[in-house]
């Protein structure tokens, strides 16, 4: 298949090559793959600009492109059966070389959903418009083509080759020609960065005359992550030109001797490297040795450096990297300490709030304080908790055990409280009698009285009503007649209760409030006392107390 490398751009640790040729996406990928690469990724705006540059290079040399709107394959594809995902930047497409779903995209138009065939992406170039960095090629999605039928307007493709590192271009100090041969079989005489394992052939001389010298170099790793040719001194130097040709091939300063010879030098603050051409900063911080947020600080006379960490961090054993200080190891808080990146915060247990003497101190929350009591009636504060109680004639009720509910004495267990009629009232009850009967002095029994056609005696008086003020479960007074053994109606008991005596008050068991360990109880959001962080203090997401269900074992709340 005819695909010619027309252009190459190397930058960072990758090279991009642009090829013209009407190939299917699979053929294009195969071509890239044969030389150790893949169809190009366009994972960022910067990468899009690199790809645009290599396409611009190609278009400058390529006169015979047939379509005004030309398309060049890139390595973005969606397999058959995989459907469009409009929520993702890549819409369900993925890069052929693998890798994460990247945030950058530049779709030409809204994609139509189609899962039945493989889809491939090309860069859409309008050849009637100049290629500008501000106008990056759009992504066009379509069929992937097949051998001999690449698809509409497909004019070529872009490959990407990744490398361990790059060498700087060789500097010539006199007339000559450098030819670089890359590992992906491209030859070029002008690369702004030359990939690792490339060869450089240098032919010195004017070109028309006999060449006097030739050199061969390989771009290799001279030390960890240090890539260089290993040449020393400028190449193709000529006494005829001295420093006048390309600054003698020197990186910074060029110094001529009287005999036409010259040497490279460096400006103050820089030193000459082993290649006798390149200058590097004397400042040891210029190589950014510090990592993880550490700042490089020059030592005396600029000779060495130390790394310094922001507040709340410390240097690790390498002395180059910052790690979080665990301030909680020093127990700075009265109750709970939460280590955070660059700081910490104190939290109080449930039922406590920030306050009291000292940093990180906690004090008991008085849940029974005026205006904040969660109890319907009685409230007793305890250290870190509270419990609710109810007045006589009421019992604790509600899911959270903070409400009070009237006890219906007329249906209490242990037998009927009244001999005849029973009238339940808020917080109490009264007995009554059927017509012709009157209530005995004990308030429970009925005795035969004068015949009367009026209503049954003993309904509650007005003053009996509303005894249980504050109850959230009001009940209407009801009479519950039942038939006793002699045929007289009696109340039907339903709740267990000891036999009533005038001096036996009805009291509630205290509510057990528990910490948020999974048991029910009063749960209060932890409240934050303070924070020390580079980013400043953080507000808690605290809130009002919420109340859980009642525990029936009659113990006080604890956290």
């Amino acid at each position: 298949t005819g695909a010619d490398t027309e252009a190459v751009v190397c930058v960072g640790t990758a090279c991009y090559t642009a090829h013209s040729g009407k190939l299917s996406a699979a053929e294009a990928q195969n071509h890239c793959n044969q030389n150790g690469g893949n169809l190009a990724t366009v994972k960022s705006k910067e990468e899009a600009q690199h790809v645009q540059r290599v396409l611009a290079q190609l278009l400058r040399r390529e006169a015979a492109l047939t379509a005004r709107m030309s398309k060049f394959w890139i390595g973005l594809q969606r397999e058959k059966g995989k459907c469009l995902d409009p929520s993702l930047p890549l819409k369900g497409f993925s890069w052929v070389g693998g890798g994460e779903d990247t945030p950058y995209s530049n779709w030409h138009k809204e994609l139509r959903n189609s899962c039945i065939s493989k889809r491939c992406v090309s860069l859409l170039l309008d050849l009637s418009q100049p290629l500008l960095p501000s106008r990056l090629p759009k992504w066009s999605e379509g069929p992937c083509g097949s051998p001999g039928s690449p698809g509409s307007n497909i004019e070529g493709f872009v490959c990407k080759f990744s490398f361990k590192g790059m060498c700087r271009p060789l500097a010539l100090g006199g007339p000559g020609q450098v030819t670089y041969t890359t590992p992906f079989q491209t030859t070029s005489s002008s690369l702004e960065a030359v990939p690792f394992a490339s060869a450089a052939n240098v032919a010195c001389g004017e070109g028309d005359k006999d060449e006097t010298q030739s050199h061969y170099f390989l771009c290799k790793e001279k030390a960890p992550d240090v890539f260089d040719w290993g040449s020393s001194g400028p190449l193709c130097v000529s006494p005829k030109y001295g420093c006048n040709f390309n600054n003698g091939g020197c990186h910074q300063d060029c110094f001529e001797g009287g005999d036409g010879s010259f040497l490279c030098g460096c400006r103050p603050g820089f030193r000459l490297l082993d290649d006798l051409v390149t200058c590097a900063s004397r400042n040891p911080c210029s190589s950014s040795p510090c990592r993880g947020g550490a700042t490089c600080v020059l030592g005396p006379h600029g000779k060495n450096y130390t790394c310094r960490c922001p507040q709340g961090y410390q240097l690790d054993s390498s002395q180059l990297d910052c790690v979080d200080v665990d301030e909680c190891q020093d127990s700075p808080c009265a109750q709970e300490c939460v280590n955070t990146p660059g700081g910490f915060r104190c939290e109080c247990w449930v039922g406590y709030e920030p306050g009291g003497p000292g940093e990180g101190a906690c004090q008991d929350v008085d849940e029974c304080a005026l205006g904040r009591s969660p109890c319907a009636q009685g409230c007793t504060n305890t250290d870190g908790s509270f419990h609710c109680s109810c007045e006589e004639g009421y019992v604790l009720a509600g899911e959270d055990g903070t409400q009070c509910q009237d006890v219906d004495e007329c249906v209490g267990p242990g037998g009927p409280l009244c001999d005849s009629l029973c009238f339940n009232t808020q917080g109490s009850f009264h007995c009554g009698c059927l017509p012709g009967w009157v209530l005995a002095p004990n308030g429970v029994s009925c005795t035969m009285g004068p015949v009367s056609l009026g209503p049954p005696s003993g309904p509650p008086d007005e003053e009996d009503k509303g005894e249980k003020e504050g109850s959230t479960v009001p009940r209407a007074a009801t009479a519950s007649p039942t038939r006793g053994p002699e045929g007289t109606p009696k109340a039907t008991p339903t709740t267990s209760r000891p036999s009533l005596s005038s001096d036996a008050p009805i009291t509630s068991a205290p509510l057990k409030m528990l910490a948020p360990s999974g048991s029910p109880g009063v749960w209060r959001e932890p409240s934050i006392h303070h924070a020390t962080a580079a980013s400043g203090p953080q507000e808690p997401a605290g809130g009002d107390s919420s109340v859980a269900t009642q525990n029936n074992d009659g113990t006080d709340g604890q956290k």
Partner: antibody
Framework: QVQLVQSGPEVKKPGESLKISCKAS????????LNWVRQMPGKGLEWMGR????????DYNGKFKGQVTISADKSSGTAYLQLSSLKASDTAVYFC???????????WGQGTLVTVSS | DIVMTQSPDSLAVSLGERATINCRFS???????????LYWYQQKPGQPPKLLIY???NLASGVPDRFSGSGSGTDFTLTISSLQAEDVAVYYC?????????FGGGTKLEIK
């Protein structure tokens, strides 16, 4: 398998020169750094220099610069260490060592004992 | 040049016991790429050195797992968890971060 085979022991007089060879096999000779390491009797190891046979690029330890020359012949897969103006203090075992992709010295020659004595 | 100090000069340990050799460098060997360019070599009498540990903590091919390497940017340790008779040798640390490559002075390990 990777092998580095060095030339045999040498006895030299002070002021003479000497060229030790190291024949490599079992790997792509041109694509790995080849180091030379000295070990004086009863002493530790000292790195002298290295060569990249692919293009002949060399690096030397400043301590040995001017006294030693490292070269290589790609076609035969052989590296050389030349010692000039020998002194009694050059008496040592000289090792050739391959540098691997992890910057380790992974394969060592058996060593060449050089004795300089009048 | 990066200077290294190896300690102790010699060490006697009983068979089956743990042996520890230390090496300190004048400069951090932790590269900005996250790799620490520290190596350990073993040299038995009359033999060339043999690579034991590369890049601080990685065991070279064929090396028993009783050998381990650890450390930080400047301080490193070679540990033999249970000394065997065949471990009697001189051990060297080395750095390959910056030219010239340098070796520690060596630690002679013997059986007590």
């Amino acid at each position: 398998q990777v092998q580095l085979v060095q030339s045999g022991p040498e006895v030299k007089k002070p002021g003479e020169s000497l060229k030790i060879s190291c024949k490599a096999s079992g790997y792509a000779f041109s694509s790995y750094w080849l180091n030379w390491v000295r070990q004086m009797p009863g002493k530790g190891l000292e790195w002298m220099g290295r060569i990249y046979p692919g293009d002949g690029d060399t690096d030397y330890n400043g301590k040995f610069k001017g006294q030693v020359t490292i070269s290589a012949d790609k076609s035969s897969g052989t590296a050389y260490l030349q010692l000039s103006s020998l002194k009694a203090s050059d008496t040592a075992v000289y090792f050739c060592v391959r540098g691997d992709g992890y910057w380790a010295m992974d394969y060592w020659g058996q060593g060449t004992l050089v004795t300089v004595s009048s | 040049d990066i200077v290294m100090t190896q300690s102790p000069d010699s060490l006697a340990v009983s068979l089956g016991e743990r042996a520890t050799i230390n090496c300190r460098f004048s400069k951090s060997l932790l590269h900005s790429n996250g790799i620490t360019y520290l190596y350990w070599y073993q040299q038995k009498p009359g033999q060339p050195p043999k690579l034991l540990i590369y890049q601080m903590s990685n065991l070279a091919s064929g090396v028993p797992d009783r050998f381990s390497g650890s450390g930080s940017g400047t301080d490193f340790t070679l540990t033999i968890s249970s000394l065997q008779a065949e471990d009697v040798a001189v051990y060297y640390c080395a750095q390959n971060l910056e030219l010239p490559w340098t070796f520690g002075g060596g630690t002679k390990l013997e059986i007590k």
